[in-house]
C-alpha cells in the first residue's frame, strides 16, 4: 500500500535496531515516468541494496557501534540510465541494543585519603566505558561498592557516586578512619549498564587499594604558661602544621580582647608575644586557621588553649583602711568579736593566696596586753582574757599582720566597747491595723511606717533595731528598711502583690538588735507587732510563659507547616486570643485559640534569619487587656541559591592581536550558608563550541581561571558563558557571562577612536 512501506522518491529517515537479521523490506520506491529504475549510493557497507524496481532492503544484521547512521542516496534513472530524479538523501538510523558490556579502564586503582577529610569530597575516580549508546539505558553506567575490606562494625567508611564513579568518605569514615589502627583498605567496585536497574544488565568489577594517611592538622595539647615571665619575648609555646607545605597560618581571637598576646609564623609555630598576667586573665582560647594562597580556609580551625600559671605576685590586701567591731562590756571569754577578711588576688586555694593572721600590736595595753586573739587561718577575733569595761577603755586599736608565703600586710582594727545589751526593743504599737492596697501598687512603694525603741546605749549594736517579717509573707513580697538615726522602720513592696494568690496577709514583725542580748534577757511580746494587708483585684493583662519564644525550621518547609507555638495565661482566668504583629514579610499566621504558628508563604533564610515578629495575647471579654512577647524563627539553610559571579566583571580586555594565549581569574559566590570551609564550586564552559576557543580551570572552591585556547580572535567583544555548580544537595547550577573584549591597545589600555561607542572596557589582562 502507498504510505508506510511504499511511495514516491523523497528524502526519508528509517530507524532499524542493530543485531537483528533482516525480516522485511525497508521501503518500495515507486517510479514516475520517465524513470524506470533506481540506484543506491553512499554508506551502504554492502549491507543496503536497492533492486532496480525500487525495493530497498538490507541483507545482514547492523552494528551501531560500527556505524550509527548510514547516509544513503537513491536516484531514479530513465531507460538510458540517466538520472531523472534525485538523488535524494535516505538516512538509516541504527538503534542501539545492549550488546556491549561495560569495562573499567583499569583492573586495579590505587589512591590515598587523609583521615578526617571532608565527607563527600572525591579523592579518587574509577572510570568504565561502554560502547553502547549513552543516550539509552544500554550505555548508562551505575557504579557500586561491592565490598569494603576490612569492614569494622559493619560500617561503610567509603561511598561512591553511582553516576560519576567518584569515591569519597562517608561521615563515619571522616570521623573514624585512623592510619594507626588501619592504614589501608580495599574496595571491590562494580559497574553495571542499564543504569543498574535491569536483571539483564552487563557488569564488570575492579579493585581499589586505598592508603589512609595521617591528618596532622590537629589541635595541640593545652599549654601552660607562667605569668610575668622575664624571658625575652616572643616565646614559642606550641605549634600547628597543615598536611601540605604552602599553607598560610593565622590566629583568630574569638574573645575580641583589647590586647591579644599571641602570634603565629608561616611555619605554624605559635608564640606568646608579651608577659601574661594571671590576675588580668587566667586562660585564653583562640583558633589557628590554615588558608590557601587565595585566602580560603583549607579545613576547620583548631582550638588552642593556654592556661596562665600563677606566681605569688600579689600581697594580701585589707578589706578597708580600718575595720570596726563592737564588743559588749560583759561578754564572756572566747566570744566572737568579728572576722577580719583580707584578700589576695593570687590563685584561690593555693599557697600563693593562703593567708595567716597575727596580732602584732594592741593599744592601749590596758588593763593588760593580749586581751584579744585572732584565729591564724580564719581571721576571727575573740575575747582572750577577761571582760572589758567601757569606763576604763572605751576603744582598742589592733594592728594585725596578714601574710601569704612571701608578702606581709598590716591591717588595722578598731574595737569599740559598748554598753551591755540588757534592754529589748519595744514596739510603740502591737497592732498596726488593716491596710488595703490594689495589687498593681508600684514596687518600691512605702506602705507603712513602724517604730520600736531600745533603751540601750544609742548608736551601738545594742540599741540598733533590725525589723524582720517572721510570718505572713512567705513569698517575700515585703521588706523593711530601718533609719539608723531614728530606728524607724519603713515597710516597702519588694515584689508585685497578687490578689489571685494572696488576697489577705496577716503579717508579724519582730524587732531585734544586731548584738546578742545579755544572759537571762529574752525577746518577748513587746518586740512583736502585727498588721493585716488586704489586696484588691485589678484586671491584669495576660502573661506569656516566656519573654522570647524561639523555633527553628528549614527554610524550605511546606506552606502550612507548624513552625512554633506560644502560650499565655490570664491571671483572672479569662480566655485568650492570640495575634501577630510586625509580620512584615507575611510569612506567618497564628491560631487565635491555641497559639500555634504556621507558615503561609515560602520562607527564605537569605532574606534574614532569625525572623522576628511580635505575638499579642488579648483577653477575650473583660477589658480586652493585652500583652506582647517576641517570636524568633531561626531559618536553617537549604541549598536554594545558584552560584553567581562575586562581582561585576565588565571591562575585561585582551590587547589585540594576542601574542600568546592569555587568562583571567574570576570569583564565584552564592547566598547560601557556608561553614568554615566555604563553598566548593565546579566550573565548566556554557556551550560545547566555546571549548574551541576557551578553557576554564578550577583554582579552588570559589575561584577559576578562564584562558584562551589560541590567539586567533577577532577584534570585538565576546560574551563567554560559564556554568558554575555548587555541588550542594540538591546541586544548583548558574550560568554566568564574562564579557571579554579584544581591542587595539595604546600603552596597555584599549584604544578608542573619537566617537567610538561607550561601554569600553578598562581592565587589561
Amino acid at each position: 500500500q502507498e504510505g508506510k512501506f511504499s511511495g514516491p522518491l523523497k528524502p526519508m529517515t528509517f530507524s532499524i535496531y542493530e543485531g537483528q537479521e533482516p525480516s522485511q523490506i525497508i521501503f518500495q520506491f515507486k517510479a514516475n515516468p520517465p524513470a524506470v529504475t533506481f540506484e543506491l549510493t553512499g554508506e551502504t557497507d554492502n549491507i543496503f541494496v536497492i533492486e532496480r524496481e525500487g525495493l530497498l532492503y538490507y541483507n545482514r544484521a547492523l552494528d551501531r557501534e560500527t556505524r550509527s547512521t548510514h547516509n544513503l542516496q537513491v536516484a531514479a534513472l530513465d531507460a538510458n540510465g540517466i538520472i531523472v530524479e534525485g538523488p535524494v538523501p535516505i538516512t538509516i538510523k541504527v538503534k542501539d541494543i545492549n550488546d556491549n558490556r561495560p569495562t573499567f579502564l583499569q583492573s586495579k586503582y590505587e589512591g590515598s585519603v587523609r583521615q578526617n577529610s571532608r565527607p563527600g569530597k572525591p579523592f579518587l575516580y574509577v572510570n568504565a566505558t561502554d560502547l553502547d549508546d549513552p543516550a539509552t539505558p544500554n550505555g548508562q553506567l551505575y557504579y557500586q561498592i561491592v565490598i569494603q575490606l576490612p569492614m569494622i562494625n559493619n560500617v561503610m567508611y567509603f561511598q561512591i557516586n553511582n553516576k560519576t564513579g567518584a569515591i569519597s568518605l562517608t561521615r563515619e569514615g571522616s570521623q573514624e578512619l585512623n592510619p594507626a589502627k588501619n592504614p589501608s583498605y580495599n574496595l571491590v567496585i562494580s559497574v553495571k549498564d542499564m543504569g543498574g536497574q535491569s536483571e539483564n544488565s552487563f557488569s564488570d568489577t575492579t579493585s581499589v587499594d586505598i592508603i589512609v594517611t595521617e591528618n596532622i592538622w590537629k589541635a595541640p595539647k593545652p599549654v601552660e604558661m607562667v605569668e610575668n615571665s622575664t624571658d625575652p619575648h616572643p616565646i614559642k609555646i606550641t605549634q600547628v602544621r597543615w598536611n601540605d607545605p604552602g599553607a598560610q597560618y593565622s590566629l583568630v581571637d574569638k574573645e575580641k580582647l583589647p590586647r591579644f598576646p599571641f602570634s603565629i609564623d608561616q611555619e605554624g609555630d605559635i608564640y606568646v608575644t608579651q608577659p601574661l598576667d594571671r590576675e588580668e586573665k587566667d586562660a585564653y582560647v583562640f583558633y589557628a586557621v590554615a588558608k590557601d594562597e587565595y585566602g580560603k580556609p583549607l579545613s576547620y580551625p583548631l582550638e588552642i588553649h593556654v592556661k596562665v600559671k600563677d606566681i605569688n605576685d600579689n600581697p594580701p590586701t585589707c578589706p578597708s583602711p580600718v575595720t570596726v567591731f563592737e564588743v559588749q562590756e560583759n561578754e564572756r571569754l572566747g566570744n566572737s568579736i568579728g572576722t577580719l577578711t583580707a584578700h589576695d588576688r593570687d590563685e584561690e586555694n593555693t599557697a600563693n593566696s593562703f593567708l595567716n593572721y597575727r596580732i602584732v600590736e594592741q593599744t592601749p595595753k590596758l588593763p593588760m596586753d593580749g586581751l584579744f586573739l585572732i584565729q591564724t587561718y580564719a581571721g576571727m577575733l575573740q575575747l582572750a582574757k577577761q571582760s572589758l569595761k567601757k569606763q576604763d577603755t572605751p576603744q582598742y586599736n589592733l594592728t594585725i599582720e596578714v601574710s601569704d608565703k612571701d608578702f606581709k600586710t598590716l591591717c588595722f582594727v578598731q574595737i569599740n566597747v559598748i554598753d551591755i545589751n540588757d534592754q529589748i526593743p519595744i514596739f510603740e504599737k502591737s497592732d498596726y491595723g488593716n491596710l488595703t492596697l490594689a495589687e498593681d501598687t508600684n514596687i518600691g512603694s512605702t506602705i507603712l511606717t513602724i517604730q520600736a525603741t531600745d533603751a540601750d546605749e544609742p548608736f551601738t549594736g545594742s540599741s540598733k533595731i533590725l525589723y524582720h517579717i517572721i510570718k505572713g509573707d512567705s513569698e517575700g513580697r515585703l521588706g523593711v528598711d530601718t533609719d539608723p538615726h531614728t530606728n524607724t522602720g519603713y515597710v516597702i513592696i519588694k515584689k508585685p502583690l497578687d490578689f489571685e494568690t494572696a488576697a489577705v496577709s496577716n503579717i508579724v514583725f519582730k524587732a531585734e538588735n544586731p548584738e546578742p542580748l545579755v544572759f537571762g534577757v529574752k525577746y518577748n511580746a513587746s518586740s512583736f507587732a502585727k498588721f493585716t494587708l488586704i489586696v484588691t483585684d485589678v484586671n491584669e493583662a495576660p502573661q506569656f510563659s516566656q519573654h522570647v519564644f524561639q523555633a527553628k525550621v528549614s527554610e524550605d518547609v511546606a506552606i502550612g507547616t507548624k513552625v512554633g507555638n506560644v502560650t499565655a495565661k490570664d491571671p483572672e482566668g479569662l480566655d485568650i486570643s492570640y495575634s501577630l504583629r510586625g509580620d512584615t514579610r507575611g510569612w506567618l499566621k497564628i491560631d487565635h485559640v491555641t497559639g500555634e504558628i504556621f507558615s503561609v508563604a515560602p520562607l527564605d533564610r537569605e532574606a534574614g534569619s532569625p525572623y522576628r515578629v511580635q505575638v499579642v495575647a488579648t483577653e477575650v471579654g473583660g477589658s480586652s487587656l493585652s500583652s506582647v512577647s517576641e517570636f524568633h524563627l531561626i531559618l536553617m539553610d537549604v541549598n536554594d541559591n545558584p552560584p553567581r559571579l562575586a562581582k561585576d566583571y565588565t571591562g575585561l580586555f585582551f590587547c589585540h592581536p594576542l601574542s600568546a594565549p592569555g587568562s583571567l581569574i574570576f570569583e564565584a559566590t552564592d547566598d547560601d550558608q557556608h561553614l568554615f570551609r566555604g563553598p566548593h564550586f565546579t566550573f565548566s564552559l556554557g556551550s560545547g563550541s566555546l571549548q574551541n576557543d576557551w578553557e576554564v580551570s578550577k583554582i579552588n572552591g570559589t575561584h577559576a581561571r578562564l584562558s584562551t585556547r589560541h590567539t586567533e580572535f577577532e577584534e570585538r567583544e565576546y560574551v563567554v558563558l560559564i556554568r558554575i555548580n555548587d555541588g550542594g544537595r540538591p546541586p544548583l547550577e548558574g550560568i554566568v557571562s564574562l564579557p571579554v573584549t579584544f581591542c587595539s591597545c595604546v600603552e596597555g589600555s584599549c584604544f578608542r577612536p573619537a566617537g567610538h561607542q561607550t561601554g569600553i572596557p578598562t581592565v587589561g589582562m
Partner: nanobody, 126 residues
C-alpha cells in the same frame, strides 16, 4: 528541540509602539542567551537585542538603544521585545532566537544561535 513562535507584529505609525512576543515550546526556555534579530529583503539578519538568562544582563544594537527593551517571563516561557518611538527604518521581519551548542561567544552573530522562529513582520509607516 526548542520551537519558537513570534507574534505581535503589524503595521504602526512612526513614533508608535509595538510589543513582540516569542513563545517557546518543546522544552523550557533554558538556553543561556536569547535574542531578537531583524531582516529586510536582500540583506542579512541584523542583531537587535540579546538577554543573558542568568543575571538578566541585556545588550542592544546601537540603532535601538533607549527605544527597545528585551525582557522575559520565565513562568510563561516567553521572550518579549518592547519597541517604542518606532521609525520607518525599523521596518523588517523580526526573528526570535536562542543559543545552543554552537555558541562561541559572539552574541550578536546569527550563526551562533541554534534555534529560530519563523519571524513576524513589523511595518512602520511615515
Amino acid at each position: 528541540e526548542v520551537q519558537l513562535v513570534e507574534s505581535g507584529g503589524g503595521l504602526v505609525q512612526a513614533g508608535g509602539s509595538l510589543r513582540l512576543s516569542c513563545a517557546a515550546s518543546g522544552r523550557t526556555f533554558s538556553e543561556p542567551i536569547v535574542g531578537w534579530f531583524r531582516q529586510t529583503p536582500g540583506k542579512e539578519r541584523d542583531f537587535v537585542a540579546a538577554l543573558i538568562s542568568t543575571g538578566g544582563s541585556t545588550r542592544y544594537a546601537d540603532s535601538v538603544k533607549g527605544r527597545f527593551t528585551i525582557s522575559r517571563d520565565n513562568a510563561k516561557n516567553t521572550l518579549y521585545l518592547q519597541m517604542n518611538s518606532l521609525k520607518p527604518e525599523d521596518t523588517a521581519v523580526y526573528y526570535c532566537a536562542a543559543t545552543g551548542d554552537s555558541y562561541r561567544g559572539a552574541d550578536d552573530r546569527p550563526a551562533e544561535y541554534d534555534y529560530w522562529g519563523q519571524g513576524t513582520q513589523v511595518t512602520v509607516s511615515s
